[in-house]
């Protein structure tokens, strides 16, 4: 195992020297630890501001965690010759706030990428596809880990964060071979509807600890290889029939639904029926009602249709009151219209007077506007009482 741990002051010199000449195949960058036997390079918690240029060609596993990279430009890992062996790249917790298009180009063996715990204010749509072609070359990525990449509110762009991530996942259909996608802890309020359709090979999808309220517009239908779907710790209130049928139709899937604020009213009946007969949901006896309060903590599996009621829109007594109120208001309206009709001549005369007064007033404004528009008369206008 070789190791380089020179002081940070010498790092820029080493970087520039390395870029001036081709790297030696087995040298170790400053501030990194290298093991050729394990094909691993670790540049961890070193406050690096850019990716080392002189990475050894043998590197298969590259850890660049806990740094201060800020921006990952296009071709951040492009080398000549290329890092043809690099299979696992971990950039978590490196204060990245921008990942540009083509950042991971020229890494032909890259199977696993972890960008977790970076406040990504900007993730290029072409970060993973590398080009803006409608269909780009397939990415070699099999595992993409994007947990907690949401930036703080003050660093967010105006556009939707969900939409930005979705665009990067679907661009050029590059990620059709992706097996694992982790998107936990990103404050997602919704899942853009076309995303999953573009990821047909997914086996593991983690959407836990987000703020998903509904899955109504999300389709899981074509995820025929999906084995694990993690939806714990969201804001799901109920799963509707369409979603239930899609999940039931996936041949290998296990779904995790713990810690959602299930609302146990009449809309929950279908989900309860499904839960009682499905083998898809893991730990289903841990699913309990959160609302309404009278049902709180009750186990969903132990609910019957008689337990699941919705408050009627209006109690019958109130309905009668509102009908009566409507009739009274209609009568008042009719009387008002009748009064207007009987006084139509007086109203017409009154309207003429109002119109004449307005015309005089507007002529005054028109005169004043002309004065203000003439730069020679500015002083006059400022003293004018018009």
């Amino acid at each position: 195992t070789s190791s380089a741990s020179s002081s940070s002051s010498s790092a820029p010199f080493l970087a520039s020297a390395a870029s001036a000449q081709p790297p030696l195949p087995d040298q170790c960058p400053a501030l990194c630890e290298c093991s050729e036997a394990a094909r691993t390079v670790k540049c961890v918690n070193r406050n690096l501001t850019e990716v080392p240029t002189d990475l050894p060609l043998y590197v298969r596993n590259l850890f660049l965690t806990g740094n201060q990279l800020a921006v990952l430009p296009a071709g951040a890992f492009a080398r000549r010759p290329p890092l043809a062996e690099l299979a696992a790249l971990n950039l978590s917790g490196s204060r990245l706030d921008e990942v540009r298009g083509g950042a991971f180009e020229h890494l032909p063996s890259l199977r696993q990428l972890d960008l977790s715990h970076n406040p990504l204010a900007y993730l290029s749509p072409f970060a993973f596809s590398g080009s803006n072609a409608s269909i780009s070359a397939p990415s070699p990525l099999v595992e993409l880990i994007l947990n907690h990449i949401v930036p703080p509110d003050d660093k967010r762009q105006n556009r939707s964060f969900e939409g930005m991530v979705a665009a990067a996942l679907v661009a050029g259909r590059a990620l059709q071979g992706l097996h694992l996608l982790e998107l936990a802890s990103n404050h997602f309020l919704y899942l853009p509807r076309d995303v999953l359709a573009q990821l047909p090979s997914l086996r593991y999808l983690d959407l836990s600890n987000n703020s998903l309220v509904s899955l109504t517009y999300v389709s899981f239908r074509n995820l025929t290889h999906l084995e694990s779907l993690h939806l714990e710790d969201n804001a799901l209130k109920v799963l509707h029939n369409g979603t239930l049928a899609e999940l039931q139709g996936l041949p290998h899937v296990r779904v995790f639904l713990d810690n959602n604020p299930w609302v146990c009213d009449c809309h929950m009946a279908d989900m309860v029926t499904w839960l009682k007969q499905t083998g898809v949901v893991q730990g289903k006896d841990r699913l309990t009602c959160a609302f309404p309060e009278k049902m709180r903590n009750r186990v969903l599996l132990e609910l019957n249709s008689a337990d699941l009621d919705c408050d009627p829109i209006l109690p019958p007594s109130l309905q009668t009151s509102y009908v009566f109120l409507g009739i009274v208001l209609a009568l008042i309206g009719a009387i008002f219209l009748l009064v207007l009709y009987l006084n139509r001549k007086g109203i017409k005369k009154w309207m003429h007077n109002i119109r004449d007064a307005c015309r005089d007033h507007m002529e005054g404004y028109h005169y004043r506007y002309e004065i203000n528009a003439d730069p020679r008369l500015t002083n006059l206008s400022s003293n004018s009482d018009v």
Partner: antibody, heavy 116, light 107 residues
Framework: QVQLQQSGAELMKPGASVKLACKAT????????IEWVKQRPGHGLEWIGE????????NSNEKFKGKATFTADTSSNTVYMQLSSLTTEDSAIFYC?????????WGQGTTLTVSS | DIVMTQSQKFMSTTVGDRVSIICKAS??????VAWYQQKPGQSPKVLIY???NRYTGVPDRFTGSGSGTDFTLTISNMQSEDLADYFC?????????FGGGTKLEIK
Amino acid sequence: QVQLQQSGAELMKPGASVKLACKATGYTFTAYWIEWVKQRPGHGLEWIGEILPGRGSTNSNEKFKGKATFTADTSSNTVYMQLSSLTTEDSAIFYCARGYRDFDYWGQGTTLTVSS
Amino acid sequence: DIVMTQSQKFMSTTVGDRVSIICKASQNVGTAVAWYQQKPGQSPKVLIYSASNRYTGVPDRFTGSGSGTDFTLTISNMQSEDLADYFCQQYTSYPRTFGGGTKLEIK
């Protein structure tokens, strides 16, 4: 109304086992988890574990695995917690509570004293 | 395990005061927090669930707030019957854990 009635105080010798009972009334017994909580002076409240009576499913705090065992009898609407290999550290008030997320109804507590 | 910390073990107060009891979680628990009141010789009684929802029958002078890691139970107009221990609890993950408690005392 919902009530959880716990068995009376126990005085046990170190090394012995004890079975505490919690009888539930006023609601559908099988529809809610029953929680067990330990309280010692100066140690606050400690969650021991839980059981779903109708299904026998249990979850335990790792700290109490091997110490506490939960069972339920649906015919008498009673949940039991057995504590084994008692030591003086097990002297405490033990509460059962109905819950899962938060615990909305509590028993009056059973005081266990372990002393030689 | 998630550690719930109530740094003030004791708080002195007087009738009519506004009292804020603070609870900090060692990691993000969203709003999965409950607050309990325990009077001497009695079982705990739940006051608040989901960080800010008051249980039916709980006086409206009790309010809960917070999310993530910082939570507060506020008693807006302290009454003598509110003298008790107050505990927070997280239920986002196993094991369920409680804060060490804050005891309200009269000055």
